[in-house]
Amino acid sequence: GVSFFFLSFHISNLQFNSSLEDPSTDYYQELQRDISEMFLQIYKQGGFLGLSNIKFRPGSVVVQLTLAFREGTINVHDVETQFNQYKTEAASRYNLTISDVSVSDVPFPFSAQS
């Protein structure tokens, strides 16, 4: 089976603009690429299947997405702990200043869209 987690965080050193609503824009693609690479680094251990339903909102930039793991390989607490532990490296490697991290269980990935 698969476990899904809804993750929300702020990138306080970036500014939202309307191009972050469109996946064909440079800004969207660059930020999505950095975030995707970052999560591959954070959850290197077996069990991480990927991320989906990425959405950007105003508030500097608020990022909302769904993470997928093989069932039983990680829990909500560990998802949040590992992400928080990576904040310093995210700043140095990707120039992303991360704050206000929130993680919750979701029954299926599309919940992130509501």
Epitope: E21, D22, P23, S24, R57, P58
Partner: antibody
């Protein structure tokens, strides 16, 4: 089915203001952007600005800055555009267009504003 | 501001004809271009997004492509319901801008 329903036609006097609405329905996202565009009689399309529904985040075309105010009400899924200091050349159909995974995905039917003394 | 030069401004064609409309961008806009259809008294409809992606429910006779700074909307076999005005729209940078429009009329 996604729908954008705009408020009805307005006739206003030069120098006055007009406020129109754009109500959206039929989509699962509760947060998204609304762009506003106008079309003067017999002319092409002109971008006015953008608001992210439920936030105070806005972008404006410099041409309209100072005369246009974009606001929204998340609970009513409605965006508003107010245009002030109206002149005859503001006579136009004003459209809202909402994002749906990408920009300008769905369009309203338009609100005709006639500026006349 | 980025200028979009759309041509032709109008054209006459018959049902079944292949129709091509072009937009030239004054600056690099990547793939950030949409094609819109406007019919009198109806809401504007997006046909193509991101240069070449067909919107849901849009017939496959519509297609979009790019060659350098030239962007093309093609209608492979014009149908009666396709007589309308078409606009290109760039959203690479603000202010977002539109082409001048192409009115497709019945020959």
């Amino acid at each position: 089915e996604v729908q954008l329903v705009q408020s009805g036609a307005e006739v206003v006097k030069p120098g006055a203001s007009v406020k129109m609405s754009c109500k959206t329905s039929g989509y699962t996202f509760t947060s998204y952007g609304i762009n506003w565009v106008r079309q003067r009689p017999g002319q092409g399309l002109e971008w006015i600005g953008y608001i992210y529904l439920g936030s105070d985040y806005t972008e404006y075309n410099e041409k309209f800055k100072g005369r246009v105010t974009l606001t929204s009400d998340t609970s009513a899924s409605t965006a508003y555009m107010e245009l002030s200091s109206l002149r005859s050349e503001d006579t136009a159909v004003y459209y809202c267009a909402r994002s749906a995974g990408s920009l300008f995905g769905y369009w309203g039917q338009g609100t005709l504003v006639t500026v006349s003394s | 501001d980025i200028q979009l030069t759309q041509s032709p401004s109008s054209l006459s064609a018959s049902v079944g004809d292949r129709v091509t409309i072009t937009c030239r961008a004054s600056q690099d806009i990547g793939i950030t271009l949409n094609w819109l259809q406007q019919k009198p008294g109806k809401a504007i409809k997006r046909l193509i997004y991101a240069t070449s992606s067909l919107d849901s429910g849009v017939p496959s006779r519509f297609s979009g492509s790019r060659s350098g700074s030239d962007y093309t909307l093609t209608i492979s076999s014009l149908q009666p319901e396709d007589f309308a005005t078409y606009y290109c729209l760039q959203y690479a940078s603000s202010p977002y801008t539109f082409g001048g429009g192409t009115k497709v009329e019945i020959k």
